[in-house]
């Protein structure tokens, strides 16, 4: 649905690419929702360009976005969250390109936080826990989480585990002994709502014991 439009204001009638993408975040600030849009071409001259959303709104017909450097942003309680809204790029009163979007299909969850790993002596495993603000939300409550971990020396060799809970157990025998690991997690809507992966949580770092040290705290110094 990304559109191209001829900019009649330019004498040479050059064809500019005004295609854009948006994501919504529901109940991102109390009961307020947000909608963020940006041009896919970073070289678009955005000086006189505005974004407007119309339809599927409560009490108002249209809303204008605020411009924040390269992005366009709305924070409001007025999204109906039923049906499609029309989002347009405008110069003055002229629409250059529009997209009809259901805001419930472009949801980007907030990043998980409080990621932590604890080594369980005796059980010889690592319990991964994290938190998500979505547990307290009314709308986007059900998420799929992607936990990614790697041995720190393996730059791009991430192992991914998908789960719906906020707890994961990693068996020590499945990990390399005496190794340093990095772990992080992100989330995506998983029930009714659709959309995009959240940002990654901050990473947490943990070490695996040497093979012969299955219990007892060993200071390696």
């Amino acid at each position: 649905e990304s559109g191209y439009a001829q900019n009649g204001d330019l004498e040479d009638a050059e064809l500019d690419d005004y295609s854009f993408s948006c994501y919504s975040q529901l109940e991102v600030n109390g009961s307020q929702h947000s909608l963020t849009c940006a041009f896919e071409d970073p070289d678009v001259n955005i000086t006189n360009l505005e974004f407007e959303i119309c339809g599927a709104l409560v009490e108002v017909k249209c809303l204008n976005f605020r411009k924040l450097q390269e992005i366009y942003f709305i924070e409001t309680k007025k999204f109906l969250l039923i049906g499609k809204s029309n989002i347009c790029v405008k110069v003055g009163e002229k629409s250059l390109t529009c997209k009809k979007i259901d805001l419930t299909t472009i949801v980007k969850p907030e990043a998980p936080f409080d990621l932590s790993v604890v080594y369980r002596e005796g059980a010889n495993d690592f319990v991964v826990t994290f938190n998500t603000s979505h547990l307290q939300k009314k709308y986007v409550k059900v998420l799929m989480h992607d936990v990614a971990y790697r041995q720190e020396k393996d730059e791009n060799k991430w192992t991914h585990v998908n789960l719906s809970s906020t707890k994961l157990t990693l068996l020590q025998r499945k990990l390399q002994p005496a190794a340093m690991y990095e772990i992080k997690v992100r989330s995506i809507p998983d029930h009714y709502f659709k959309g995009f992966w959240s940002e990654w949580s901050p990473s947490y770092y943990f070490r695996t014991p040497e093979i012969n040290n299955s219990s007892g705290e060993m200071d390696p110094i």
Epitope: L115, S116, S203
Partner: antibody
Framework: EVQLQQSGPELVKPGASVKMSCKAS????????MHWVKQSHGKSLEWIGY????????GYNQKFKGKATLTVDKSSSTVYMELRSLTSEDSALYYC?????????????WGQGTTLTVSS | DIVMTQSHKFMSTLVGDRVSITCKAS??????VAWYQQKPGQSPKLLIY???YRYTGVPDRFTGSGSGTDFTFTISSVQAEDLAVYYC?????????FGGGTKLEIK
């Protein structure tokens, strides 16, 4: 011998900021998480947050987000905690504590504490 | 946040007696509980981690037990130098949380 040496007592006015330090010695500094814990007078212990010296990664108790900022100087094996917009509620004894080797989740060595008094 | 509750603020005991301090977690924390001793005017010291593992150099009169939500710290034969406040801490998830402390008094 592992040692965590904290900076001296601070007396500051309400609304001001303060930055206290914790200098580590006797172990490989960048290998261990460093945590900060608050102990109000005659009260229990409250975890503030951690910093991982190797890359400066940190995590905070949501209660202290915006109040505390943890930083690290690897060259001097020192971690810092800055507390801002101080009120009398921030008057307390603040400890740095080293997280354990594998996961950093509990605390095997503690500094001697820095006493913060907020008073006009 | 996980709340750690130490039901007794104070416990009084005689030298040589056995004493047990309890700690209850508001949710399952498996075996991820540590116990600390804080003597008057001193910093806390780690005694027990992972519910039942004695930290290096800690006398064997100190033991820990429990899993899930209920944990116990025991001194098998109390010595005069054990006068202190004892804290439990869950190391299961962030934020790390401590119990309110139990002050052990020697009669």
């Amino acid at each position: 011998e592992v040692q965590l040496q904290q900076s001296g007592p601070e007396l500051v006015k309400p609304g001001a900021s303060v930055k206290m330090s914790c200098k580590a010695s006797g172990y490989t500094f960048s290998d261990y998480y460093m945590h900060w814990v608050k102990q109000s007078h005659g009260k229990s212990l409250e975890w503030i947050g951690y910093i991982y010296p190797d890359n400066g990664g940190n995590g905070y108790n949501q209660k202290f987000k915006g109040k505390a900022t943890l930083t690290v100087d690897k060259s001097s094996s020192t971690v810092y905690m800055e507390l801002r917009s101080l009120t009398s509620e921030d008057s307390a004894l603040y400890y740095c504590a080293r997280g354990t080797y594998y996961d950093g989740s509990y605390f095997d060595y503690w500094g001697q504490g820095t006493t913060l008094t907020v008073s006009s | 946040d996980i709340v750690m509750t130490q039901s007794h603020k104070f416990m009084s005991t005689l030298v040589g007696d056995r004493v047990s301090i309890t700690c209850k977690a508001s949710q399952d924390v498996s075996t991820t509980v540590a116990w600390y001793q804080q003597k008057p005017g001193q910093s806390p010291k780690l005694l027990i981690y992972s519910a039942s593992y004695r930290y290096t150099g800690v006398p064997d009169r100190f033991t820990g037990s429990g899993s899930g939500t209920d944990f116990t710290f025991t001194i098998s034969s109390v010595q005069a130098e054990d006068l202190a406040v004892y804290y439990c801490q869950q190391h299961y998830s962030i934020p790390r949380t401590f119990g309110g402390g139990t002050k052990l008094e020697i009669k």
